[in-house]
């Protein structure tokens, strides 16, 4: 006999990375039936939701106003079918952003590379933080983390087409609360020509739409919003 | 044109600090790193570090460290570079060169340390 | 750091000769490698980057090539200006390093 639901999916609107003081809403998708749904914060119990009716919906919201670094942290949720409890999800990693000042971002050897060469990020920050974070712009999120006094090397390797896109840093002041982003730096990777076609760079998010970072526009299933979002995230663990 | 224009060459003491200037021109300033190379009597060429003019973000050779700080004047497309506790094994021509790449260089100042 | 080693060390060569020159680097450096050149007295001159990009107003008798951490540079016909050392240059990775330089002299 099954002792509990599988568990759902959580994820974070329009972002997973929130600037301080916008708004935000954590979605957790369960089952339909659902009576009950309990968003959970840093372990202990944040909310309740009971949708109505249970039968029709399966995906409750929870938002946050104003983002701010008390919000930030881990979040999950369970839901409830009659007596019978899910699992609970996978962790969100919610974070603030626009604490403080802005980071530098440099590339070497220079934005214009020749496929093969040896690419590495230089993100600076002088305030007092010791993690840094380079962020691709498109929907893999890609996330490279990075330490150093006031500054840190996020060395690519030999890059290839794949490596195209535009790139910002963060400094960390802890996992869940991070600097402004630096000023994009856009990669353009030139040479490789038998592989152009085959590796377009990732879909990239207009340019306006930095004003709140990275916000998708993409409509697909819920679900992979979670798993991109969860993506991004491991390695804020 | 591209040109970098290095200051004049210097002789100092040892335990003496240089400060060798380079002046860019012919190109956006702020879009490219400068690096600073050495170069011994009769020897080969040393990469001493690079400096990039947009975020001063600098990248020193661990071997000069503690020695060598690189700073940037934009207003005059300007790059320092000041090697302290100079010793005689100092005594090179020092050059800087742009881009990643080491695209264009100085002409090279000649840096003397005697006592 | 990456070690880059230079050979021969020095070389003498007719004009109208084919000269190579090789580098072999301690690890990997992609494709991340110049070829200079420089005469007595004056600055390093950029011949070859990337590996095997020529410098505009090089002439096309320079031709470089290699990946991982072999590399070649090729003088297909020496010409009396040529005459001068050459250094390979890694800049895949921080220190970036020379070779310890090619004298290549008159026969």
């Known amino acids: 006999q099954q002792q509990t639901l599988p568990k759902p999916f959580i994820w974070a609107e329009p972002h997973f990375m929130v600037p301080k003081e916008k708004q935000v809403t954590i979605c957790c998708q369960g089952n339909y039936g659902a009576v009950e749904y309990q968003l959970h914060f840093e372990g202990s119990l944040f909310a309740v939701d009971r949708p109505k009716p249970p039968e029709r919906i399966n995906k409750v919201q929870f938002y946050i106003p104003d983002m701010n670094s008390r919000m930030a942290g881990q979040y999950s949720c369970i839901y409830r079918v009659g007596e019978l409890w899910s699992e609970p999800s996978n962790l969100l990693d919610l974070v603030v952003t626009e604490m403080y000042d802005t980071p530098t971002l440099s590339v070497h050897p220079g934005p214009e590379v020749i496929s093969g060469e040896k690419v590495t990020f230089y993100c600076r920050l002088d305030t007092a933080t010791s993690m840094f974070l380079l962020l691709k712009e498109g929907r893999s999120s890609h996330v490279q983390r990075g330490y150093g006094k006031v500054q840190a090397e996020f060395p690519l390797g030999p890059v290839t087409t794949a490596h195209r896109g535009t790139y910002r840093c963060f400094g960390s002041y802890n996992n869940h609360a991070w600097s402004f982003p630096s000023e994009p730096v856009k990669l353009l990777v030139t040479g490789d020509i038998e592989n152009t076609s085959l590796a377009p760079e990732d879909p990239t998010f207009p340019a306006d739409t930095w004003g709140t970072y990275l916000l998708t526009t993409e409509t697909g299933l819920q679900k992979d919003h979670a798993l991109w979002d969860h993506t991004a995230q491991n390695l804020l663990r | 044109q591209v040109q970098l224009v290095q200051s004049g060459a210097e002789v100092k003491k040892p335990g003496a600090s240089v400060k060798v200037s380079c002046k860019a021109s012919?190109?956006?300033?702020?879009?490219?790193?400068m690096n600073w190379v050495r170069q011994a009597p009769g020897q080969g060429l040393e990469w001493i570090g690079m400096?990039?003019?947009?975020?001063?973000?600098?990248n020193y050779n661990e071997k000069f460290k503690s020695r060598v700080t690189m700073t940037v004047d934009t207003s005059t497309s300007t790059v320092y570079m000041e090697l302290s506790s100079l010793r005689s094994e100092d005594t090179a021509v020092y050059y800087c060169?742009?881009?990643?790449?080491?695209?264009?260089w100085g002409q090279g100042t000649t840096v003397t340390v005697s006592s | 750091d990456i070690q880059m080693t230079q050979s021969p060390s020095s070389l003498s060569a007719s004009v109208g000769d084919r000269v190579t020159i090789t580098c072999r680097a301690s690890?990997?450096?992609?494709?991340?490698l110049n070829w200079l050149q420089q005469k007595p007295g004056k600055a390093p001159k950029r011949l070859i980057y990337?590996?095997?990009s020529l410098d505009a107003g090089v002439p096309k008798r320079f031709s470089g090539s290699g990946s991982g951490t072999d590399y070649t540079l090729t003088i297909s016909s020496l010409q009396p200006e040529d005459f001068a050392t050459y250094y390979c240059?890694?800049?895949?990775?921080?220190?970036?390093?020379f070779g310890g330089g090619t004298k290549l002299e008159i026969k």
């Open positions: 060169a742009r881009h990643g790449r080491f695209d264009y």
């Open positions: 012919g190109y956006t300033f702020t879009s490219y790193w």
């Open positions: 400096i990039h003019p947009n975020s001063d973000i600098t």
């Open positions: 690890q990997d450096i992609g494709s991340s």
């Open positions: 990337a590996t095997s």
């Open positions: 240059l890694q800049y895949a990775s921080s220190p970036f390093t």
